[in-house]
Interface confidence: low
């Protein structure tokens, strides 16, 4: 632990100004792990001059700086690039002059106290009076700065000509693809100072590459894949003083696939899984032994987990018997094509013939968490209709 | 279809000025970077530079930097070329082309081909 | 700046094989999940015409006897079958992020 700090695992406090520390507190090899340190305090340092690139680095865990009543003058561009954790930032009644919001904008900061700098009044420091007045709570910071008089001028009536927040303006077409086709997006941005214009795509999974002049860019996405429908894309405008997003959500349209389809499972009802994915939602119909079923209350589709476009369900069958075996077809469809699979479902043997008895279903309230979403009309003549599994069984349980 | 339409042949003296033309059709011209590269006789291709007509922002190969300036005239859908203090090594080729999805010159003008002699 | 140094400079081909031509980056030309390289061929007397934009996509026209492969730094353009009409200069050419962009030397093939 540096000479004017105590350490703790979790913590460093230097506040000693005898002798003081000249440089950001550094932990040396072998000592405590700086990754679980997630306190600094500062105090009383006259000499801490420079927070550079790499001195808080190895502190990812950091959540509360600290750094009063002492020297500080300047805080590198990159200082807290690894800190994502930090959340309390308190550099009160020190030397800076002027600070960058790059220091604090990829950080997710609930308190940021400046008071008690002597900041020059220009429009590096006009994203501070935005950021307060965006909090405009009742604590709000006291915060002043010198002019070209050496005057104390306070922030909150800062004014300076060609110095505001940008704006961003997406001009986005229908957002609704089909899979596999490619767009175009354009955005403008417009401020003083002119703002810096780039897309954030997030975890897009469709190829894509923009070009990007200062004030307008377009972004094209090549081959739109499913996996990529309800993603939001976003075009940022960003200056000195703070930022724009113009954003909008990507929609995509595509062929249904049925990706799962299981042998039934026996629970307080069997159950034939399946999942079924594709935009707009699909419409389930259920074939038995190559005729159309026929569902009912005893024998139904039940969407149990919606995903976006991926839907999680079951064929409910209560209680059936060796009447309800046989092959079991999914026909998923929208207007972009369909899909189907089959699988084969055995429920019991047929009687006389020793292959498991019926289940002894325990007395269990099922939970809908869905609706039968099989919305393909019945056309079929009914002589191949499965079996209705409406039966009492012996308890007088009617199932 | 999309097409780039440059101006003729130009025959011009050393120290001379000259502006190549390049007339775009068949797309927004404002919103597609527009490209130039010469190309010497029998030589290479050089890339010169790239203008946005949307709002003019340019970048240039320095070894081009105060030969050639990029303009363009959204009105007229045209993008222009002018190289200044013309010697006989500025003599070739020179091309037009547009930026197509990830920076590939997918369209180029027919060239217009620059002699700097006295 | 990026320099692209293409191989062979010139090179003769049967008539029904396989050219291939090579472009080396002297840095990584990747960027955004795409490798920023293009190859075109240029005839005499006429522009160059893109053939492969980033790295392996066709574009469209161009007939499915060219094709593209490589990513960072090492690239190739493989023409198979060759045919008459194929004999050309062939560039490669990077757009890498920030400009300047470059183009390699140029590969003449000749069909034998």
């Known amino acids: 632990c540096p000479t004017s700090c105590k350490c703790s695992a979790s913590r460093i406090w230097c506040s000693d100004p005898s002798p003081g520390i000249v440089a950001f507190p550094r932990l040396e090899p072998n000592s405590v792990d700086p990754e679980n340190i997630t306190e600094i305090f500062i105090a009383n340092q006259k000499r801490l001059e420079i927070i550079n690139e790499d001195d808080v680095e190895a502190y990812v865990g950091l959540r509360n700086l600290t750094i009063v009543d002492s020297g500080l003058k300047f805080v590198a561009h990159k200082a807290f690039l690894k800190n994502s954790n930090l959340q309390h930032i308190n550099f009160t009644r020190n030397k800076l002059t002027s600070l960058s919001r790059k220091h604090f904008r990829h950080l997710d900061l609930s308190e940021l106290i400046l008071v008690g700098n002597p900041f020059t009044c220009s429009c590096d420091i006009m994203w501070i009076k935005t950021l307060q007045e965006a909090k405009s709570s009742p604590d709000t910071q006291d915060l002043y700065c010198l002019n070209e008089s050496s005057k104390n001028i306070p922030l909150a009536n800062l004014q300076i000509p060609n110095c505001g927040l940008p704006s961003a303006n997406l001009a986005a077409p229908n957002l609704t693809v089909e899979e596999g086709k490619s767009i175009t997006l354009s955005c403008s941005v417009a401020g003083d100072p002119v703002p810096n214009m780039y897309w954030d795509v997030g975890n897009l999974v469709s190829k894509h590459m923009n070009e990007t002049s200062h004030t307008q860019g377009s972004l094209r996405i090549t081959n739109i894949s499913s996996d990529d429908s309800g993603k939001q894309i976003s075009c940022v405008a960003e200056n000195l003083v703070g930022e724009d997003q113009d954003s909008v959500n990507l929609t995509v349209h595509f062929a249904p696939t049925i990706t799962f389809l299981e042998s039934p499972t026996s629970d307080h009802h069997w159950c034939i899984p399946f999942t079924v994915k594709g935009n707009p939602k699909p419409a389930l119909q259920w074939f038995y032994n190559g005729a159309i079923l026929n569902e009912s209350k005893y024998i139904c589709t039940k969407i149990h987990v919606t995903n976006h476009t991926e839907y999680h369900g079951c064929l409910q069958l209560d209680n059936p018997t060796h009447m309800n075996n046989g092959d079991y077809t999914l026909i998923a469809k929208n207007e972009y094509g369909k899909d189907e699979k089959q699988i084969s479902a055995h429920f019991m043997g047929w009687p006389g013939i020793d292959d498991g008895a019926n289940p002894n279903y325990p007395d269990v309230i099922y939970e809908d968490y869905g609706t039968a979403a099989n919305d393909i009309g019945d056309t079929t003549n009914r002589s191949n209709e499965i079996p209705s599994t409406d039966v009492t069984d012996k308890t007088g349980r009617e199932h | 279809q999309v097409q780039l339409q440059q101006s003729g042949p130009e025959l011009v003296k050393p120290g001379a000025s000259v502006k190549i033309s390049c007339k775009a059709s068949g797309y927004t011209f404002s919103s597609s970077w527009m490209n130039w590269v010469k190309q010497r006789p029998g030589q290479g291709l050089e890339w010169i530079g790239r203008?946005?007509?949307?709002?003019?922002?340019?970048n240039y190969n320095g070894k081009f930097k105060g030969k050639a300036t990029l303009t363009a005239d959204k009105s007229s859908s045209t993008a222009y070329m002018q190289l200044t203090s013309l010697t006989s090594v500025d003599s070739g080729v020179y091309f037009c082309a547009r930026s197509g999805y990830g920076y590939g010159f997918d369209c180029w003008g027919q060239g217009t081909t620059l002699t700097v002699s006295s | 700046n990026i320099v692209l140094t293409q191989s062979p400079a010139s090179l003769a081909v049967s008539l029904g094989q396989r050219a291939t031509i090579s472009c080396r980056a002297s840095?990584?030309?990747?960027?955004?999940?795409?490798?920023?390289m293009h190859w075109y061929q240029q005839k005499p007397g006429q522009p160059p015409k893109l053939l492969i934009y980033?790295?392996?996509n066709l574009e469209s026209g161009v007939p499915a006897r060219f094709s593209g492969s490589g990513s960072r730094t090492d690239f190739t353009l493989t023409i198979d079958p060759v045919e008459a009409d194929d004999a050309a200069t062939y560039y490669c050419q990077q757009n890498n992020e920030d400009p300047p962009w470059t183009f390699g030397g140029g590969t003449k093939l000749e069909i034998k």
């Open positions: 203008i946005y007509p949307g709002d003019g922002h340019t």
């Open positions: 980033l790295a392996s």
């Open positions: 840095e990584s030309v990747d960027n955004y999940g795409n490798s920023l």
